[in-house]
């Protein structure tokens, strides 16, 4: 995922509407001019701002990586929402890339949770019911998992 960054400031194009700040702040979908006197609209599909703010530049829209699907496009008030493709997932502690879900559980374990865009399949020990740590198993059973149906975005929104 492309990191949030400042969109380069350009001369105000005709379509970029100006308005006056309220209490020194500009509404979502706008940024403030350097002198603090004007609110300038973000450019649809290019940059955005989600809150009342005094940013000198709107934030650059995220572009979904290959291996991701775009759940919703970037608007002037909300960043793009990207999600891992079916059969892959993104963990909170490694949000930079989608990883392939395991196709099955190690011997002696059973699957209790499907692959979703935000989690790998979940395996527990048959007897104790304790969870597997999540490392790729050395030997896998033939039991395969079907990818979970995407329900909500696992990646960033504004």
């Amino acid at each position: 995922i492309t990191q949030q960054d400042l969109a380069p400031q350009q001369r105000v194009a005709p379509q970029q509407k100006r308005s006056s700040p309220s209490e020194g702040l500009c509404p979502p979908g706008h940024h403030i001019s350097e002198d603090g006197r004007d609110c300038i609209s973000c450019k649809y599909g290019q940059d955005y701002s989600t809150h009342w703010n005094d940013l000198l530049f709107c934030l650059r829209c995220t572009r979904c990586d290959s291996g991701e699907v775009e759940l919703s496009p970037c608007t002037t008030t909300r960043n793009t929402v990207c999600q891992c493709e079916e059969g892959t997932f993104r963990e909170e502690d490694s949000p930079e890339m989608c990883r392939k879900c395991r196709t099955g559980c190690p011997r002696g374990m059973v699957k209790v949770g499907d692959c979703t865009p935000w989690s790998d399949i979940e395996c527990v020990h048959k007897e104790s019911g304790t969870k597997h740590s999540g490392e790729a198993p050395a030997v896998e059973e033939t039991v395969t998992s079907s990818p979970g149906t995407p329900a909500s975005p696992c990646s960033l929104s504004g």
């Epitope: 949030q4 400042l6 309220s22 809150h51 009342w52 703010n53 940013l55 934030l59």
Partner: nanobody, 126 residues
């Protein structure tokens, strides 16, 4: 890319003082207001103070009013937080923040920020 670097944290006795600095590199602070938040062990991040770099208007959380003073030196691209009469409950990691975010224009307390420093630890203990 906006980068914020805090310094000045350390161990101080109750009643003592510290001055924190926040320097911006790259494309300055990226916003007109710059603020300080803090996060005490096991607690959420809370707003401390903010300053408007254009006109010097300042904002403070009730818990630090009269004890902390925020200031700026635009020529050095730096914002300072002078902390006096420090108390044990001021112990926290202090974060410099820019691109402060508000739910409403009339709000004095931001709900978050776009840009954050790495934080500097302030410990108030005897």
């Amino acid at each position: 890319e906006v980068q914020l670097l805090e310094s000045g944290g350390g161990l101080v006795q109750p009643g003592g003082s510290l001055r924190l600095s926040c320097a911006a590199s790259g494309r300055t602070f990226g916003s007109i207001r710059v603020g300080w938040f803090r996060q005490a062990p096991g607690k959420g991040r809370e707003f401390v103070s903010a300053i408007n770099r254009n006109d010097g208007t300042t904002y403070y959380a009730d818990s630090v009013k009269g004890r902390f003073t925020i200031s700026r030196d635009n020529s050095k691209n730096t914002v300072y937080l002078q902390m006096n009469s420090l108390r044990p409950e001021d112990t926290a990691v202090y974060y410099c923040a820019a691109g402060l975010q508000y739910n409403r224009s009339a709000d004095r307390v931001p709900v978050g920020a776009v840009y954050w420093g790495q934080g500097t630890l302030v410990t108030v203990s005897s």
